[in-house]
């Protein structure tokens, strides 16, 4: 595809390796050049598939650095998007390089959800917070949201006791265990364990995506308070 | 995140005695409580002693070390210490300390911010 302003195919080279990275759904674009003696500027454009008349936006005009910011520029996370981007050196552009399809949702990471964990007389409470993400620049939770398909499902929720793992779900849908902030696991002590540590992911809907790992939380409960 | 050295562990015969070390880097160490563990290789980490934040405040010790160990810190130098008397072979482990939460009945810590710990050996 070229630009109106390109004055003939090898006169300016095209960018390479237009790559896109999202981290809680923040979606930067990246991409390569070689160096050349005068310094080249970069416009970056975005389509968004899905919308009405969907039509190439621009994102980041004439900027000197390697990447863009796209965030501001996406619309439903779960959606495909595609970027181009085209150099300028003096009054000569490239032709536009594209980027491969892309969906914030599916391609991207979303940081681990944070834990605490405490004892209330014979349960440990684990509290799972959802993870925060960006979304047109507002911070949010990535709990359960019937208007968006992309939002965390369920947490599988990893719980060590002495020595051996037990794997437990929790539905992000079930009121009695979830609400916007967080999902709520009780688990009964027993006078044969007292160690416990738990780690969770989250695991988004449709594409089974998993949110990273949280860190492992662990509690020993002291000997005197777990016999009987 | 508070960076952590444990020292003062080596060869000592059965009876024998140590003092471990633990010196924290970080202005916070006096927020957090501390707790000492030891691992034998192939089992988990097991809590031995704890030290809630404050200075002589409540400590916490495993059945298998009470009336032998004593953990006490000393927060204008960061450092955390575990006096180790009348040690038996089966104290052998390396030893471990990390930050953590004092609660009534718990210790809660995060199972990431270990040093590279200290070996004790007890021979008999």
């Known amino acids: 595809e070229m630009g109106t302003a390109d004055l003939g195919p090898s006169s300016v080279p095209t960018p390479t390796n237009v790559t896109i990275e999202s981290y809680n759904m923040n979606p930067i674009v990246y991409w390569e050049y070689q160096i050349m003696p005068q310094v080249p500027v970069f416009t970056v454009e975005v389509k968004n598939y899905g919308v009405k008349n969907s039509e190439w936006i621009d994102a980041c005009i004439n900027i000197s650095h390697h990447y863009c910011n796209i965030s501001d520029h996406v619309g439903d996370p779960s959606n495909s998007l595609w970027v181009r981007v085209k150099a300028r050196v003096g009054q000569k552009e490239s032709a536009y390089a594209k980027s491969e399809e892309f969906a914030v949702c599916r391609d991207g990471k979303i940081g681990p959800p944070k834990l605490d964990i405490r004892k209330e007389e014979k349960q440990i409470m684990i509290d799972i917070f959802h993870p925060s993400v960006f979304v047109n620049g507002d911070e949010q939770e990535v709990d359960y949201d019937p208007e968006t398909t992309c939002y965390i499902r369920v947490y599988n929720v990893y719980v060590r006791m002495n020595g051996s793992e037990i794997q437990y779900k929790i539905l992000t849908q079930k009121e009695d265990d979830c609400d916007e902030i967080q999902c709520q696991l009780a688990i009964p002590v027993s006078s044969l364990n007292s160690q416990y540590c738990v780690s969770a992911e989250g695991v988004l809907h449709v594409w089974g995506v998993t949110t990273e790992k949280s860190k492992e939380v662990c509690i020993t409960i002291f000997n005197s308070s777990i016999k009987g | 995140e508070v960076q952590l050295v444990e020292s003062g562990g080596g060869l000592v015969q059965a009876g024998g005695f140590l003092r471990l070390s633990c010196a924290a880097s970080?202005?916070?160490?006096?927020?957090?409580?501390m707790g000492w563990f030891r691992q034998i290789p192939g089992k988990e980490r097991e809590l031995v002693a704890a030290?809630?934040?404050?200075?002589?405040?409540?400590?916490y010790y495993a059945d298998s070390v009470k009336g032998r160990f004593t953990i006490s810190r000393d927060n204008a130098k960061n450092t955390v210490y575990l006096q180790m008397l009348s040690l038996k072979p089966e104290d052998t482990a390396v030893y471990y300390c990390?930050?953590?939460?004092?609660?009534?009945?718990?210790?809660?810590?995060?199972?990431?911010?270990w040093g590279k710990g200290t070996q004790v050996t007890v021979s008999s």
């Open positions: 990390t930050t953590g939460d004092y609660y009534s009945d718990y210790f809660k810590y995060d199972n990431e911010n």
């Open positions: 970080g202005r916070t160490f006096s927020s957090y409580a």
């Open positions: 030290i809630s934040s404050w200075s002589g405040g409540s400590t």
